[in-house]
Amino acid sequence: QEGKFSGPLKPMTFSIYEGQEPSQIIFQFKANPPAVTFELTGETDNIFVIEREGLLYYNRALDRETRSTHNLQVAALDANGIIVEGPVPITIKVKDINDNRPTFLQSKYEGSVRQNSRPGKPFLYVNATDLDDPATPNGQLYYQIVIQLPMINNVMYFQINNKTGAISLTREGSQELNPAKNPSYNLVISVKDMGGQSENSFSDTTSVDIIVTENIWKAPKPVEMVENSTDPHPIKITQVRWNDPGAQYSLVDKEKLPRFPFSIDQEGDIYVTQPLDREEKDAYVFYAVAKDEYGKPLSYPLEIHVKVKDINDNPPTCPSPVTVFEVQENERLGNSIGTLTAHDRDEENTANSFLNYRIVEQTPKLPMDGLFLIQTYAGMLQLAKQSLKKQDTPQYNLTIEVSDKDFKTLCFVQINVIDINDQIPIFEKSDYGNLTLAEDTNIGSTILTIQATDADEPFTGSSKILYHIIKGDSEGRLGVDTDPHTNTGYVIIKKPLDFETAAVSNIVFKAENPEPLVFGVKYNASSFAKFTLIVTDVNEAPQFSQHVFQAKVSEDVAIGTKVGNVTAKDPEGLDISYSLRGDTRGWLKIDHVTGEIFSVAPLDREAGSPYRVQVVATEVGGSSLSSVSEFHLILMDVNDNPPRLAKDYTGLFFCHPLSAPGSLIFEATDDDQHLFRGPHFTFSLGSGSLQNDWEVSKINGTHARLSTRHTEFEEREYVVLIRINDGGRPPLEGIVSLPVTFCSCVEGSCFRPAGHQTGIPTVGM
């Protein structure tokens, strides 16, 4: 059969299963004159043979674990034994069968875990090896917990990563493990090959003893610190402790205060660094963080609460230099004249801010002293002895002492005696007629002037006029300002007029005094006036229901998914057409009728979130007026970025020859979102054979160490491939390359002879 089992001499690759006795020839090479015979060289291991006529075969079962690839060369010779064709490469790939069982590297493992450790964070790895090909199911290992002892309430506290053998706590384990209740656990772990999927898989078991240790990384009790402390600072106020020595502590001020008066030392002791002022800030909340030597957080931050205790360090303050009240001539005993309200910056509802009022002087003392009294705690002034007469004394001045438990302050009150309020305000017109305005009349515009007069004493509360709209303006679109000299009222627009909701408003004004009317006198129809406001329609732009619309979706939503919607209404009731503006990434489309927004392309949080576009609502018909609102699309992260090296690692070298195995540290990162504690990568070598020369070990969630397994390296560059898995959902893996050069060194640097190639590294390890 020409082609499959026979043919001319050319480079070829054959795949043969290991462990099988030879049952057929591999290939029959055909000689082209002047070639008459064939010769086989290379990695024959006395298994591969070629007969002179070109029949290539093997004479006993192959073993992939001894050699996975046999690189052979076949040459064609002429009658004189001279090579006339080739040699050509013939590659024999030995295909794996499951002829090796997995074995754990240790029959017993021991580890410890801290209570409340983060679920899913590995604290121990079990490791098994299988000589079979890891690229096939034969060498693919599957780890499982067979039993957990003790098992409380049938709840598993531990879990194992089926692929990596990483043991970690479950959510329940993180919450419930307590060394006071149960300080130790035992796990039986099994490992199977065939990915655990076959009845014919081989397996092994190991035992894991786990000690549970106490977690002392706990938030301390809230601290109370008295303000204005005169003790020498800094003063220790509390402490935190990481579970192991060597942590680096820091404080995080989430409030971004201009003055942050706390510090932490490397023992975890927390200090206040300067006196606090409760009146400036009465409580602080900040966070204590513990980090490892690489600056990575070791755990969640602890919340520290500091309450500032008040001392009486503020005197009462008067509301103004002089407080003016008015009292009518005929007012009766006990009538309220007004209330003096002093302030105290100390803590409310405590003795430090509780105020007492006392009249210390009245001038003049005519017709007698003690005409007024003040309520001790309320500060309300009352008429105490008799009605007052303006012609005798038109003005009194009171000095009032306001005190808290330590401080006294004097406040001054002027009491003006005014004529009795026996005249009501009278409008000069009872009806101000009709007024027609466009609905887009500017806010602040004066639209009408009204006037009432009052015959009481001028420039007193008895004659001062306040105008109120008591009917026809429930929305509060209008207001009235009074000129205190003329009592003229100016009707102004306070809120936009609206033809659609109030085309005609029948407005009623009331004119009244700030002082009460004397007994027996009442406001009547003369104190009321009306007018009619007619609002005309203006074609207005559509109005969005919100200034900013916000929606939240996962960055991996399918194209065509509805991601949000916007709504606008046209005041005139016209239909609206929606469109998008500023969709720079071309991610979105909007249904021009409904305002629903859909994705039209893959979204990417890492390109920027939130994604901000403008939505435009345009009238259909009419004058096509439009208005604009914002649509913010918040993209929630999915694990869609594989890990990569955090920086460029060209330039790593070891001085050749190595005197002892060496190592170097590298850092990984990825572009996905990570919670406070950062990524948790796992590291392994990128191909099975690299394990003969190299070893990779995890330092923490982002750093790993690449070490040489021996010292017998050539003086040359090696490119080491490393797999980095982010452990996400789904887990993503990146293969990165670390170029490492072994070179002759002079004074710790790579020696480069003149004219040597550029690019040889210059950073030693």
Epitope: N71, A135, S687, D693, L721, S737, P739
Partner: nanobody, 126 residues
């Protein structure tokens, strides 16, 4: 399993250019390191160029540096070798290669590559 098929070889005059292509089938061209070797008649296979896909960095034999450029198109599953300023000593069979599980770090050794194409003949006449 990866199958590699080279094309683009041929006869060219000294100083001329050729572009070799290598199509990967069987699975995506996911090998972290892919490259080109060549074999002169009666000689051992010799490293020409390698492309380390993880960082996009390249390595070249001193004899071809500045004249040859290796590149890949992941979307099309293709590896290329652009050969300029060709010399008669570049005459050889050129093989496309990709790493598998036997890779040990020495990217310029034939034994490091599990997957080989059948080769394409490049002849440079003077």
């Amino acid at each position: 399993e990866v199958q590699l098929v080279e094309s683009g070889g041929g006869l060219v005059q000294a100083g001329g250019s050729l572009r070799l292509s290598c199509a990967a089938s069987g699975r995506t061209f996911s090998s972290p390191i892919a490259g080109w070797f060549r074999q002169h008649p009666g000689k051992e296979r010799e490293f020409v160029a390698a492309l380390i896909s993880t960082g996009g960095s390249t390595r070249y034999a001193d004899s071809v540096k500045g004249r040859f450029t290796i590149s890949r198109d992941n979307a099309k599953n293709m590896l290329y070798l652009q050969m300029n300023s060709l010399k008669p000593e570049d005459t050889a069979v050129y093989y496309c290669v990709a790493t598998g599980n036997t890779y040990r770090g020495a990217y310029d050794r034939p034994a490091e590559y599990d997957f080989w194409g059948q080769g394409t003949q490049v002849t440079v006449s003077s």
